[in-house]
């Protein structure tokens, strides 16, 4: 005999006490596939997690972070405070990046400004914080006869404080 | 910002049938529960029912059935109310307001539609 | 269905005092409670949801608690622009329905 569930869509669950009627999924929740002898409780967007998505009967609510925080993990399973521009996040805040890093996001972590001189190139533009060194023309390229239309800025000096 | 743009207000005759609409602005159409309710003069909220514009899945009171239709149309982000065999007691501001699970957050601001002869 | 009772249906308060409105469901139905309020000639706003969680933009003065069958919603220092009708609406199960409301009347 065939199991009258199977027939239930998605939407819906089997619902034993009806004679395996199809009874639609209540509010808060959902069925993604078919045959299902209940339905999934839906995700909440609370606390840092804001609704992007509400959950409809075939599919789970998706969420976001409210603003100062950002989404990590698979569904934006969790949520990290954001940080400005030139700092990075440490388990005792937002910190700003060591002399030598950046950071142009809100999130992730300080990187090392680029080595412009292992590509055989100078410092164009000087690294911040915020912001990667430009690298300019090698300094071979520069010699009296090339025409240069900015002077590369000198590099800044080892010991210098962060601006 | 979010906006529920509804229809302005009706005039029609017993027997006829009318299509409200509520155009949506500032967020996904496709992602939130339209709810429909109606508010007669001096009179509460009454609940008519509900759609998911991403799949047209709808929900309605016991009421209701038969009495309202509920669509959105997904390329001009509006949702429509169909009220058909119209009567004196179907006199009422209608309301569509966006969200259900979470409650409503957004509103529309209401269509006022009379029946006459 | 689950009908929600609002009670009472008229409530006069003097301004700064602290009042309750109450919602009774006919059955269970968890926290799923949204609180509305609607003054005159305008459309109804949301001042709480899931029974007690606030929503941005609307004044500390609102909150709300309960679960089960039984909710309440307070505004803890009433104010002349709070004159208006107050909603429940549970989304536990289909159909969703509002309470018949409360109107909130200065004396």
């Known amino acids: 005999l065939q199991d009258l569930c199977s027939n239930c869509p998605a939407g819906t669950f089997c619902d034993n006490n009806r004679s395996q009627i199809c009874s639609p999924c209540p509010p808060n929740s959902f069925s993604s596939a078919g045959g299902q002898r209940t339905c999934d409780i839906c995700r909440q967007c609370k606390g840092v997690f804001k609704t992007r998505k509400e959950c409809s009967s075939t599919s789970n609510a998706e969420c976001d972070c409210i603003s100062g925080y950002h989404c990590l993990g698979a569904e934006c399973s969790m949520c990290e405070q954001d940080c400005k521009q030139g700092q990075e996040l440490t388990k005792k805040g937002c910190k700003d990046c060591c002399f030598g890093t950046f950071n142009d996001q809100k999130r992730g972590i300080c990187r090392p400004w680029t080595n412009c001189s292992l590509d055989g190139k100078s410092v164009l533009v000087n690294g911040t914080k915020e912001r990667d060194v430009v690298c300019g023309p090698s300094p071979a390229d520069l010699s009296p006869g090339a025409s240069s239309a900015t002077p590369p800025a000198p590099a800044r000096e080892p010991g210098h404080s962060p601006q | 910002q979010v906006q529920l743009q509804q229809s302005g207000a009706e005039l029609t005759r017993p027997g006829a049938s009318v299509k409200l609409s509520c155009k949506a602005s500032?967020?996904?159409?496709?992602?939130?529960?339209i709810q429909w309710i109606k508010q007669r003069p001096g009179q509460g909220l009454e609940w008519i029912g509900t759609?998911?514009?991403?799949?047209?899945?709808?929900r309605y009171t016991q009421k209701f059935k038969g009495k309202a239709t509920l669509t959105a149309d997904k390329s001009s982000s509006t949702a429509y109310m169909q009220l058909s065999s119209l009567a004196s007691e179907d006199s009422a501001v209608y309301y569509c307001?966006?969200?259900?699970?979470?409650?409503?957050?957004?509103w529309g601001q209401g269509t006022t539609l009379t029946v006459s002869s | 269905d689950i009908l929600l009772t609002q009670s009472p249906a008229i409530l006069s308060v003097s301004p700064g005092e602290r009042v309750s409105f109450s919602c009774r469901a006919s059955?269970?139905?968890?926290?799923?409670i949204h609180w509305y309020q609607q003054r005159t000639n305008g459309s109804p706003r949301l001042l709480i949801k899931?029974?007690?969680e606030s929503i941005s933009g609307i004044p500390s003065r609102f909150s709300g608690s309960g679960s089960g069958t039984d909710f309440t919603l307070t505004i803890n220092s009433v104010e002349s622009e709070d004159i208006a009708d107050y909603y429940c609406?549970?989304?536990?199960?289909?159909?969703?329905?509002f309470g018949g409301g409360t109107k909130l009347e200065m004396k």
């Open positions: 307001a966006r969200g259900l699970l979470e409650g409503a957050h957004y």
């Open positions: 500032g967020y996904t159409f496709t992602n939130y529960w």
């Open positions: 759609i998911y514009p991403e799949n047209g899945d709808t």
């Open positions: 059955q269970s139905i968890g926290a799923s």
């Open positions: 899931f029974s007690s």
């Open positions: 609406q549970q989304t536990n199960s289909w159909p969703t329905a």
